[in-house]
Interface confidence: medium
């Protein structure tokens, strides 16, 4: 059975979109209605994990290329990073935990939790141009995403 | 308490076949998360990964044994099987079968092996 | 495939000494790794599990750090009972590959 996957962008609570700055790293920033298509559209992939009533475990690849979203330990803390993968491999239905992420729906906004880091959350700064980053919701943080599908 | 045992390990001829049998107790391969994998060891040599099967069914082989040989389960007999055809010299080893859960693949209880000889 | 490296295949070391046993990774495995003890004869048993976390049961003396491509098994105060086979095992992609073992030999 091949692995189901839908194709979404996401902008953050503050409407700024996400963008693929270097070959690994993905950047949050208001794009005006001429760059528009520079957001990276994201491959969700619903795979092997944990599901509960408010938690669907999914993974996140960036359409059209081998990479996805993980989460590792770095230096004593839960990071994020791009990962290339084998596309002969990947997406598959039992991702490694790395790879996976508790799709958490809050009203009309999503939260997207480390599966391997509990309490960690994809995030964004409040300022523009910094990286998308793996934070444990304290401060200013942004944590909640809206997803817009786009067709396959 | 965990207990994993080999066996169906002998001499064979180069070419023949082999099942080897990993009857365990103390854990259930119905259980979600739950992986048994066979490893070997060639005499005097480090430990290889064989080939591993999930709880649900999903399977994973190394290159050098995928297409030759076949892991599969019986939940009912609490066993893990190694079919292994067409075989080399360099599969002489004492296989190992172990236990871990799905991801990351830590292998946390092991069987004592069983020798392969391939030989003529 | 990503190849695992234990330099040192054999290592002379005496009762009370602190042993440094070394892996390296071909790439970056994010702290995918586990260390194993071999004697010949018993089970394999996990030591360390994560890079760093200790199985249950096993003596606080062995304790594992590491991360990127280099990671190390260290164990404070040799006892008898240590004398044995030491592998690391990566577990970040298939195929999960294994050092090829580092021989911890009384001196």
């Known amino acids: 059975v091949p692995i189901r996957q839908l194709h979404y962008r996401l902008r953050d609570e503050q409407q700024k979109s996400l963008v693929l700055s270097d070959p690994y790293e993905l950047k949050a920033l208001h794009l005006n209605g001429q760059n528009i298509n520079q957001q990276v559209i994201f491959s969700m992939s619903f795979v092997q994990g944990e599901p509960s009533n408010d938690k669907i475990p999914v993974a996140l690849g960036l359409k059209g290329k081998n990479l996805y979203l993980s989460c590792v330990m770095k230096d004593g803390t839960p990071t994020l990073q791009l990962e290339s993968v084998d596309p002969k491999q990947y997406p598959k239905k039992k991702m490694e935990k790395r790879f996976v992420f508790n799709k958490i729906e809050v009203k009309s906004k999503v939260e997207f939790e480390s599966a391997e880091f509990p309490n960690w959350y994809i995030s964004t700064s409040q300022a523009e141009h910094k990286p998308v980053f793996l934070g444990n919701n304290s401060g200013q943080d942004i944590i909640d995403f809206t997803m817009e599908s786009v067709s396959s | 308490q965990v207990q994993l045992v080999e066996s169906g390990g002998g001499v064979v001829q180069p070419g023949r076949s082999l099942r080897l049998s990993c009857a365990f107790s103390?854990?259930?391969?119905?259980?979600?998360?739950?992986?048994v994998g066979w490893i070997r060891q060639a005499p005097g040599k480090g430990l290889e990964w064989v080939a591993h099967?999930?709880?649900?069914?999903?399977?994973s082989y190394a290159d050098s044994v995928k297409g030759r040989f076949t892991i599969s389960k019986d939940n009912s007999k609490n066993t893990v099987y190694l079919q292994m055809n067409s075989l080399r010299a360099e599969d002489t080893a004492v296989y190992f079968c172990?236990?871990?859960?799905?991801?990351?693949?830590?292998?946390?209880?092991w069987g004592q092996g069983t020798l392969v000889t391939v030989s003529s | 495939d990503i190849q695992m490296t234990q330099s040192t295949s054999s290592l002379s070391a005496s009762v009370g000494d602190r042993v440094t046993i070394t892996c390296r990774a071909s790439?970056?495995?994010?702290?995918?790794l586990s260390w194993y003890q071999q004697k010949p004869g018993k089970a394999v048993k996990l030591l360390i599990y994560y890079t760093s976390k200790l199985h249950s049961g096993v003596p606080s003396r062995f304790s594992g750090s590491g991360s990127g491509t280099d990671y190390t098994l260290t164990i404070s105060s040799l006892q008898q009972e240590d004398f044995a086979t030491y592998f690391c095992l990566q577990g970040k992609m298939l195929p999960w590959t294994f050092g090829q073992g580092t021989k911890l030999e009384i001196k």
């Open positions: 103390g854990f259930s391969l119905s259980t979600s998360g739950m992986g």
């Open positions: 099967i999930w709880w649900d069914g999903d399977e």
């Open positions: 790439q970056d495995i994010s702290n995918y």
């Open positions: 172990a236990r871990n859960r799905y991801d990351p693949p830590w292998f946390v209880d």
